[in-house]
């Protein structure tokens, strides 16, 4: 089965953990995609070792274990992720998580105080 | 951005040939790598592909005559005794197993083994 | 051993047809199927992968379908700038295969 944190959120600018937690007493875990949405973050074979897809090469970091390490985090990576366990003998298993990415307390706090500056 | 960087030249027979590509923007140490050719006039041929980890896979034809490893920065394809029959463009590219694609390209480099 | 065969090899369209080139696969590769443009004296481009996905600034016109060990590449509303050469690669297994990739398919446009 898959164990993971249903849904999580981070700062803009930030980063953020993303894990999926495989246990099983029979099968061995062959291969692990990570997804957003449709599109590949990464994957992991035990043949070949980690590849984090070009389009996210700068900003996202294989582990721990066989996680992400997801950084520089911008508004639009709020959504959909999905890890996909590829094991043997056992077979897909696949999690989900839903991330949101909120704006900085930083921001906020500035917003904050820019609001009940005075006027004049 | 990744970018991929190769250079050939023209060879004899009896060199070892050895191909160096240069990647930037990326790291080797979470990237798969890969080698194509392509003869003149002919189809895409896959060489074979290098894993983060170092691990290797070679097309059966590529066996024991082709070599690929790695720096931190650099992949390398020799090819020992190489024949004219090895007379081809070479691109290295980024991925090539269960990656959604090999992307980016580099923009391939002629090598001619000629006596 | 996984073996690609494209069809045809070449093909003759004109500007606003259709062209649709095939791919079979000798044994099931799970939609891990790619295509790939060429045109002379440049590296191949990244067209659609996982079979049907647009990668990043590829034009609608182009598609991919297919599932098993079928697939196809379909260029609707054909344009001058296509003609140029296509290849499948599968990305299933790299482990005792001679080629990942398809033989390629000529498209001229008249």
């Known amino acids: 089965t898959i164990d993971t944190k249903r849904n999580i959120s981070a700062e803009e600018g930030g980063s953020v953990i993303l894990q999926c937690h495989f246990s099983s007493d029979t099968a061995e875990v062959t291969q692990v995609d990570w997804k957003q949405q449709d599109q590949l973050l990464a994957i992991y074979s035990v043949d070949l070792g980690w590849h984090v897809a070009s389009v996210f090469s700068d900003r996202v970091v294989p582990g721990p274990s066989l996680g992400l390490t997801f950084q520089s985090l911008t508004m639009n990576d709020t959504g959909e992720y999905f890890c996909t366990y590829h094991t043997y003998p056992g077979g897909i298993y696949k999690g989900r998580i839903f991330l949101k990415v909120q704006e900085s307390s930083d921001d906020r706090n500035g917003l904050a105080q820019f609001q009940t500056a005075p006027l004049g | 951005q990744v970018q991929l960087e190769s250079e050939g030249g023209l060879f004899k027979p009896t060199d070892t040939l050895t191909l160096t590509c240069t990647v930037s923007?990326?790291?080797?140490?979470?990237?798969?790598m890969s080698w194509v050719r392509q003869a003149p006039g002919k189809g895409l041929e896959w060489i074979g592909i290098i894993g983060s980890n170092g691990n290797t896979y070679y097309a059966n034809w590529a066996k024991g005559r082709f070599t690929i490893s790695k720096t931190s920065t650099t992949v390398e394809l020799k090819i020992t005794s190489p024949t004219t029959e090895d007379t081809a463009t070479y691109f290295c590219?980024?991925?090539?197993?269960?990656?959604?694609?090999?992307?980016?390209w580099g923009p391939g480099t002629l090598v001619t083994v000629s006596s | 051993d996984i073996v690609m065969t494209q069809t045809p090899a070449s093909v003759e369209v004109a500007v606003g047809g259709t062209v649709t080139i095939k791919c079979q696969a000798s044994q099931s590769i799970s939609s891990y199927l790619n295509w790939y443009q060429q045109k002379p004296g440049q590296p191949p481009k990244l067209l659609i992968y996982?079979?049907?996905k647009l990668a990043s600034g590829v034009p609608s016109r182009f598609s991919g379908s297919g599932s098993g060990t079928e697939y196809t590449l379909t260029i609707s509303g054909v344009e001058s700038a296509d003609a140029a050469t296509y290849y499948c690669q599968q990305e299933h297994s790299v482990g005792n295969v001679d080629n990942v990739f398809g033989g390629g398919t000529e498209v001229v446009v008249k």
């Open positions: 923007g990326s790291s080797l140490s979470s990237s798969y």
């Open positions: 590219a980024r991925g090539g197993y269960r990656t959604s694609g090999m992307d980016p």
């Open positions: 996982d079979a049907l």
